[in-house]
């Protein structure tokens, strides 16, 4: 099946993704839509009043006017001047200025523990499951199944560190080889990267603030997945990482240390504790083959616990299995030795929700799942209200250019590798690389940060979550402290080598360039975004997991015809871009194709037949919501609301002429002001801090 | 309190085989290990081999292996041991017992025996 | 098989005396050693097992010591209820073994 073109021009025509760009309503103002009746919120205002200098006509002659979509947002200010403010509007600046920043950390700080009951509900829902993965004998000969079993099972828990520490308790158990682990590991880089993507989904109702934060979130599945397509291939031919850690773990005498720190985990915890606390021992039980605790609940009950050391008669196959004669002993048919028994005694419950409810895990992790992902949406949305709204005029140009600016020249090439430094730095603080770029994703999406500068930030961020497993490695008992040092290595080695395949040559970027692609569709399509999402970290998976238990013969006889028409079709997109010519005419293009085999638009079609049913009454509510939250956050009477349903009552893709819309913008204030209609704000609401 | 009644006493032609019941009562039957023990004229206590009747699994002296075997008819609270192939020197007191000192082969309760005499 | 020799296999005492009863195993058996008190025409019957503890209702005057091969069967004061054969037992492994008795009598 052939690609679908909205990829392959993703950079050369953006204006063709730009449905702004190509559809817009009749620049007569339209009486039904000059005012929103059902908003009594709302001043009364004409949505687009569009002046001589913006004229169709001039549009269409200058072509240079429909803006690069991956160009940042000019977000000017729209506030009174400091200067020009009295005492009492200084105050009021400054507290409202306060205010927000409180504001801004009460919802990051939900954020990232929505992002923890996240995961918690992952496990609950499908940890058995994944524990269960890891239990598939395949794994030790068959790397490919190893890949995919990393990736499920952390897509399933949520969570690297999860499957990470089960790889290296089952690796420190002889039950998995450290060959036989790299795989997996690889598998759990790829599938941490899904959280982001999900985050990014939350921003869907701006297209071009969707455009940008799927792309900057999606820049890191595909530096995780092209990483892998050339570095697994690279490990099962040479065996360099575990070759090169092995060295490492036997140049030194560790002496395992203290316990890695908990940064954000500190101020978190006692909040996440309080909803569920989870027991994590039985999913790497259950990946060790311990029948027991397949019966075991993942809600932990009892967090206060006596453990008493105990001598007991317990009886043994034979006299070979006692540790000296006198320490046995019959009772005429039965051996018995005295063994050292542990029991432990619950003495204080949990103090979390679900104690007391005794509620299957499934059904625990469901609520956890809807409740988690609206307090992340919820959370998500107000981040970006806040961060619209502080991020204006000189404190939106100082932060933009800090962020955004290189180094003068001659040293302009190591911004990229400080902000690297940067993303492992920030990784490091917040222990986790999912709550890292799952916050750098909105900040991509309302445009404060370019998508070449996240992707260095969140290569930075893959290094971090591995130099805080190599702590926690240094940290863990005897036993497993060598097999959790190499994996750590391992997981480290293999970001490094990714690092110098995809980013320092900038021809060698391309996670950039396919993240732009797929953003460019996912705006057009939004449906692709959840699409995408469930073939590369479900579909694909499954499959090759599916296969891989098949056997070798089948794996190979269905991925290579796979392969192959995958590298047939790549070839033949690069010769119809590069030097058409040499082709024949039929193969100039993807015409000679079935419509619905190299374009999404008939797809489109069937999808929104589906869902249109849905669309209404979602928007009714979407408003509410939005028109509450606007209500209680204080936000100018000109906020935009429920973009999605604007999107919606314009038409999905209405015929008109290429002129500027304000979906290129980031709100309808700035939109205002590019049309030339600036209002003067009201100084309770709008307030600029310098 | 604890009971073990055996069979009254048998006279029995070598070659021949006897078998041995143990009426058991005042306790649960199937909680404790039956033990079989001989004596024979003034000799001293031969251990022949035990039973547990809740699983029904046995344990024979590799001296009797093949010669002996033990069952326990739950129903009826009852232990039974054939010994076959019958030789003179079989002749001896066969005492039931159970130990009640749960994990130990210290037998505390016995049987009255039942002399078995094996004689041409 | 593990053999229990007992020593002496028989013996003499006054009331009052002291008597000891000595039992050696061929191997390492622990401290899975029983000692049993068979009078005359009787059913044999518990004194000690884990060769110290005594079974319920057994006088103060027996007791019994001992770890690995070597046991020993003491009666503090010989009582003339005592005259008995005394047989020590391991249960250390199957088969479980007896010694060959001692006979005690009262001078």
């Known amino acids: 099946m052939a690609p679908w073109p909205e990829l392959g021009d993703a950079q050369p025509n953006p204006s063709k993704y730009l449905e702004g760009a190509t559809s817009q309503q009749p620049i007569t103002p339209d009486k039904s839509k000059e005012t929103n009746k059902t908003d009594n919120t709302e001043v009364p205002v004409t949505k687009f009043e569009l002046l001589p200098t913006y004229s169709t006509a001039t549009l269409i002659e200058e072509p240079t006017e429909v803006d690069d979509p991956w160009n940042l947002p000019t977000l000017q200010d729209s506030g009174i001047k400091w200067s020009e403010r009295d005492a009492k509007g200084k105050i009021l600046c400054v507290f409202q200025g306060i205010g927000r920043l409180i504001l801004l950390l009460g919802f990051l700080y939900f954020f990232v523990c929505s992002l923890d009951v996240l995961s918690s509900a992952f496990q609950l829902v499908g940890g058995k499951m994944a524990g269960q993965f890891f239990s598939n004998s395949s794994i030790m000969s068959n790397p490919l199944l190893g890949l995919v079993i990393g990736v499920l099972v952390t897509v399933f828990v949520q969570s690297s560190s999860t499957s990470t520490s089960i790889v290296v308790s089952m690796v420190a158990s002889s039950l998995l080889t450290v060959r036989a682990a790299i795989p997996i590991i690889m598998g759990a880089n790829i599938g941490t990267s899904i959280t982001n993507t999900i985050v990014a989904l939350m921003q869907v109702g701006d297209r071009s603030e969707f455009r940008r934060a799927f792309a900057g979130a999606t820049v890191h599945d595909f530096f995780n997945w092209l990483s892998v397509l050339v570095l697994l291939p690279v490990e099962v031919a040479t065996h360099y990482l575990e070759v090169v850690t092995q060295l490492i773990v036997e140049s030194f005498h560790f002496k395992n240390g203290e316990d890695a720190p908990d940064l954000l985990k500190v101020i978190t915890k006692p909040f996440t504790k309080l909803i569920v606390q989870l027991d994590k021992k039985v999913i790497s039980q259950i990946a060790m083959n311990d029948e027991t605790a397949k019966n075991k609940s993942l809600v932990k009950i009892w967090c206060k616990t006596f453990t008493n050391m105990t001598q007991m008669n317990v009886t043994v196959p034979s006299m070979a299995n006692c540790t000296s004669p006198s320490l046995c002993w019959t009772d005429g048919i039965q051996i018995w030795t005295m063994k050292n028994v542990t029991y432990k005694e619950n003495i204080a419950k949990c103090q979390h929700i679900f104690v007391n409810f005794h509620l299957p895990d499934l059904a625990v992790g469901i609520i956890l799942l809807i409740i988690s992902l609206l307090v992340l949406c919820g959370c998500l949305i107000m981040i970006v209200k806040i961060l619209g709204s502080v991020l204006k005029g000189q404190v939106a140009t100082v932060i933009k250019k800090t962020i955004n600016t290189d180094f003068p020249f001659p040293f302009a090439w190591l911004t990229g590798y400080l902000a690297i430094l940067v993303g492992a730095g920030m990784t490091f603080i917040v222990q986790s690389s999912s709550v890292f770029t799952s916050a750098l994703t909105p900040l991509i999406g309302i445009g404060v940060i370019t998508i070449e500068r996240a992707y260095p930030l969140t290569l930075g961020s893959n290094i971090g979550t591995t130099t805080t497993a190599i702590l926690a490695a240094l940290a863990s008992p005897g036993n497993t402290l060598r097999s959790s040092l190499q994996i750590a290595l391992c997981h480290f080695f293999f970001n490094i080598s990714g690092i110098l395949l995809w980013y320092p040559i900038p021809f060698t970027r391309l996670p950039i360039r396919m993240a732009k692609g797929l953003g460019n569709i996912s705006a057009k399509y939004r449906w692709f975004a959840i699409f995408y999402l469930i073939i590369f970290f479900f579909l694909i998976p499954l499959t090759v997991f599916g296969l891989s238990l098949a056997g070798w013969p089948v794996l190979v006889g269905v991925g290579v015809p796979v392969v192959f028409i995958i590298i047939l079709v790549l070839c033949l997109r690069l010769l119809q871009s590069r030097c058409p010519r040499v082709l024949p005419k039929k193969l100039q293009n993807w015409n000679f194709l079935p419509l619905c085999m190299h374009s999404l638009k008939p797809w489109d079609a069937v999808i929104s037949k589906f869902t249109g049913p849905f669309q209404m009454p979602c928007c009714c509510c979407c408003r509410v919501c939005c028109r509450v939250c606007c209500l209680l956050c204080g936000c100018p009477k000109c906020c935009r609301c429920s973009k999605c349903c604007q999107d919606l009552e314009e038409g999905q893709e209405a015929q008109g002429v290429p002129v500027k819309a304000p979906e290129t913008f980031d709100n309808i204030t700035i939109s205002r002001e590019a049309q030339g209609e600036v209002r003067a704000p009201d100084s309770k609401t709008e307030c600029t801090a310098l | 309190q604890v009971q073990l009644v055996q069979s009254g006493a048998e006279v029995k032609k070598p070659g021949a085989s006897v078998k041995v019941s143990c009426k058991t009562s005042?306790?649960?039957?199937?909680?404790?290990?039956m033990h079989w023990v001989r004596q024979a004229p003034g000799q001293g206590l031969e251990w022949i081999g035990a039973?547990?009747?809740?699983?029904?699994?046995?344990s024979y002296n590799q001296k009797f292996k093949g010669r002996v075997t033990m069952t326990a008819d739950t129903s009826t609270s009852t232990v039974y041991m054939e010994l076959s192939s019958l030789r003179s020197e079989d002749t001896a007191v066969y005492y039931c017992?159970?130990?009640?000192?749960?994990?130990?082969?210290?037998?505390?309760?016995w049987g009255q025996g039942t002399l078995v005499t094996v004689s041409s | 098989d593990i053999q229990m020799t007992q020593s002496p296999s028989s013996l003499s005492a006054s009331v009052g005396d002291r008597v000891t009863i000595t039992c050696k195993a061929s191997?390492?058996?622990?401290?899975?050693v029983a000692w049993y008190q068979q009078k005359p025409g009787k059913v044999p019957k518990l004194l000690i097992y884990?060769?110290?503890t005594r079974h319920t209702g057994v006088p103060s005057r027996f007791s019994g010591s001992g770890s690995g091969t070597d046991f020993t069967l003491t009666i503090s004061s010989l009582q003339p209820e005592d005259v008995a054969t005394y047989y020590c037992?391991?249960?250390?492994?199957?088969?479980?073994?007896f010694g060959g008795g001692t006979k005690v009598e009262i001078k």
């Open positions: 017992s159970i130990s009640t000192i749960i994990t130990t082969g210290a037998v505390d309760y």
């Open positions: 191997q390492d058996v622990g401290t899975a």
């Open positions: 005042g306790y649960t039957f199937i909680t404790y290990n």
């Open positions: 039973i547990y009747p809740g699983s029904g699994d046995t």
């Open positions: 884990w060769t110290s």
């Open positions: 037992q391991q249960y250390s492994r199957i088969p479980l073994t």
